[in-house]
Interface confidence: low
């Protein structure tokens, strides 16, 4: 009862709500809901009812299982959806479903910040740019991952010869997708074409 | 027709607290979602709270919002609003209705006044 | 949110009069949901109209309701003394629900 369910899914995709568990048998009613009382659709009497939404048009209701189609969804469809039963014996059962809808992350752009030659050894200064978004990170030298510390949108090391990687990546990712940007040097210290 | 009786309302200081309650009769009161709904003297209506049939879910209206909660006892058919943190501006008549197929208000109750004042 | 607003504040007639209340919504109100509620001194209010025009259970002939997206009117069409109140809009196609600031019908 009320167990809420999370569910992460890419922007554009068709989604498919549904419970674990099989419905109450014959039930009465049934009701799909976003936030707490706006209504999707209703099954009713044998019949779905699909109420005016920003969603008319782009859900579908199978009785059989209560599980709600939703197609194209967008970031604007983040919400909490509630599946409300109504039982023949007159109690009502609900589940909860929290969707969030991310969109696929841009390809990142990798920034130099700082590049300098210091004896043989290269100070870098790397920072991955991307468009106001709530993603991880992963450095890669040379396909190499950099150490977990390192994790963040700015990469800072000192690059001695025994150490020296040609190419730089930074790896954006979230639940849904994940884009590369990678940036290469020139020993000893100099900015090569990508 | 169902019925709605509200109790609990009276006097409290600011930063007290009451509990209101709302005797429903008539009804299978387990199948209907429930709000309070408020209204300080001379002044319009201002809905607060919202459960629903189960209790499972319940949503507070910005205003109140940390300070009240609303819940229910379906086996007693009574609603309750734990109002914490009282202040002036929550002095107003409290009633209690039944939010209809989640859109309207309909039937209320009589109303219980709630004044805060030191 | 979505704000009501009611005009007039106050409307005074005589009875057999018709009466003409209006709220106008600050954004279209979603598949005009929308209802009306009569409320008398020292009493609950009470349902009248919802979705914009359907009468409440055992609501006389003589209220109706009409209008769509922004722009929505409460008719009473001869006024009874009975009828003499204040009257509120809430819309429901939007969270939070939100009420008008009321209408007072009173006797000229």
């Known amino acids: 009862q009320g167990h809420l369910v999370h569910m992460t899914v890419v922007s554009g995709s068709n989604v498919t709500l549904n419970i674990s568990e099989s419905l109450p048998e014959n039930y009465k009613q049934l009701t799909w809901f976003y936030t707490f009382d706006q209504k999707i659709v209703e099954w009713d009497s044998r019949k779905s009812k699909y109420f005016e939404s920003k969603f008319k048009g782009r859900v579908r209701l199978d009785p059989q299982s209560g599980a709600l189609y939703i197609s194209k969804v967008q970031k604007e469809d983040n919400s909490t959806y509630i599946m409300r039963v109504l039982k023949k014996t007159g109690n009502e059962q609900e589940w909860k479903i929290k969707l969030q809808v991310l969109d696929p992350v841009p390809k990142p752009v990798i920034k130099i910040e700082k590049i300098e030659d210091m004896d043989d050894n290269c100070y870098l200064k790397l920072s991955c740019v991307i468009p106001g978004e709530s993603v991880n990170y992963t450095w890669y030298g040379d396909k190499r991952p950099f150490p977990k510390e390192l994790q963040n949108s700015v990469l800072e090391t000192t690059l001695m010869p025994h150490n020296y990687s040609r190419c730089y990546t930074c790896q954006v990712s979230n639940s849904v997708s994940s884009k590369n940007g990678t940036v290469c040097l020139s020993p000893p210290c100099t900015l090569a074409r990508s | 027709e169902g019925q709605l009786l509200e109790s609990g309302g009276g006097l409290a200081q600011p930063g007290g607290s009451l509990r209101l309650s709302c005797a429903a009769s008539g009804i299978t009161f387990g199948r209907y979602a429930m709000s309070w709904v408020r209204q300080a003297p001379g002044k319009g209506l201002e809905w607060v709270s919202l459960?629903?049939?189960?209790?499972?879910?319940?949503y507070h209206a910005d205003s109140v919002k940390g300070r009240f909660t609303i819940s229910r006892d379906n086996s007693k058919n009574t609603l309750y609003l734990q109002m914490n943190s009282l202040r002036a501006e929550d002095t107003a008549v409290y009633y209690c209705?039944?939010?209809?197929?989640?859109?309207?208000?309909?039937?209320w109750g009589q109303g219980t006044l709630v004044t805060v004042s030191s | 949110e979505i704000v009501l607003t009611q005009s007039p504040g106050t409307l005074s007639l005589s009875p057999g009069e018709r009466a003409t209340l209006s709220c106008r919504a600050s954004q279209s109100v979603s598949s005009n949901y929308l209802a009306w509620y009569q409320q008398k001194p020292g009493q609950a209010p009470r349902l009248l109209i919802y979705?914009?025009?359907s009468r409440a259970t055992d609501i006389p002939d003589r209220f109706s309701g009409s209008g769509s997206g922004t722009d929505f009117t409460l008719t009473i069409s001869r006024l009874e003394p009975e009828d003499f109140a204040v009257y509120y809009c809430?819309?429901?196609?939007?969270?939070?629900?939100?009420f008008g600031q009321g209408t007072k019908v009173e006797i000229k």
């Open positions: 459960i629903s049939g189960s209790g499972g879910s319940t």
């Open positions: 809430q819309q429901y196609g939007s969270s939070p629900r939100t």
């Open positions: 209705a039944i939010y209809n197929n989640y859109n309207w208000f309909d039937p």
């Open positions: 979705d914009a025009s």
